[in-house]
Amino acid sequence: FSPLRRISIKILVHSLFSMLIMCTILTNCIFMTMNNPPDWTKNVEYTFTGIYTFESLVKILARGFCVGEFTFLRDPWNWLDFVVIVFAYLTEFVNLGNVSALRTFRVLRALKTISVIPGLKTIVGALIQSVKKLSDVMILTVFCLSVFALIGLQLFMGNLKHKCFRNSLENNETLESIMNTLESEEDFRKYFYYLEGSKDALLCGFSTDSGQCPEGYTCVKIGRNPDYGYTSFDTFSWAFLALFRLMTQDYWENLYQQTLRAAGKTYMIFFVVVIFLGSFYLINLILAVVAMAYEEQNQ
């Protein structure tokens, strides 16, 4: 080993070196949180970049760059360090037009903390391992969601556009003439029935067990879907999103109530099956795989 390499190894294995890097990262993070940083922080920024460059140089000199098994670039954690330094110099010395987009990559510096704190390294390692192991479960989940999204598409396509429409029109008005002029929220409130405090028109259905309209109103299929058009089963992608929402139980009871009001109470069977299979079974299967991966990583 050359004297330079010996010195580099000594620095690298020293606990003070790890402490210095950790303090640098944390200080850097504090500086990154500043809203309107003063001008002198520019020099501090250069100092941080210098320390990170020094750290990487020490690692490269001690371990080698990329040829050989335990060299600098063979460790994925060092890829992060390398990217951080490359972007630091890129944003500083190369004129790339929209620099603000590249500045976003400064946030990666905060991730350097992971490689320095051993406990964090284990957790993140477990997380990465679990993602690898999750591939099969994810395929199963996507498959199940797709199947149910297709069923939902067949059962409920267009149903959430059913609304209670006013039974009194001007002489020159017909359903289609109104459909073509509906634009503002005011227009909608003029022709459709709204429950107090509701941002969407009251949903209804054409089957006997679906929601009925109050007196003076008739159920029609007009306008957009509820929740600014985001809640529907009109296309596969929207149906998939709705099913994902059921699986994650994200305000799912609202979707359940909307759909049952528009389609009929019989369809609660669909929701029971989806909640049991998607929410209870698949979610817990995912958690089990993550737990197993973490256990393996700890051992």
Partner: nanobody, 124 residues
Framework: EVQLVESGGGVVQPGGSLRLSCAAS?????????TGWYRRAPGKQRELVAR???????QYADSVKGRFTISRDNAKKTVYLQMNSLRPEDTALYYC?????????????????WGQGTLVTVSS
Amino acid sequence: EVQLVESGGGVVQPGGSLRLSCAASHRQFIRDVFTGWYRRAPGKQRELVARIYNEGNTQYADSVKGRFTISRDNAKKTVYLQMNSLRPEDTALYYCLFSGTISTGREYRSGDYWGQGTLVTVSS
């Protein structure tokens, strides 16, 4: 194909009567907001004559109030227009309009569904 069948048109003398009927020939007509009669006189635009909402309330054009009566038979899915005291200016092609929701088997569709029209001529 959505079909509304109008009948009852013909030639009548001023002061005479006619009864027009409009039948929804298909079970795909689910629910109407209203079913109405419109007319288009030669050289004029189509205008509302009368309409009946699904709850039974009616609406008439000022020119026919007191002379024309609109009614419906839900069991037969038919709407009638009883026209009394007919005048020459009532001469027109009378159209039936179902404004509501139909079922295509796969989905529901709301809109205006027009008949082919039946000609009413009032002349001496």
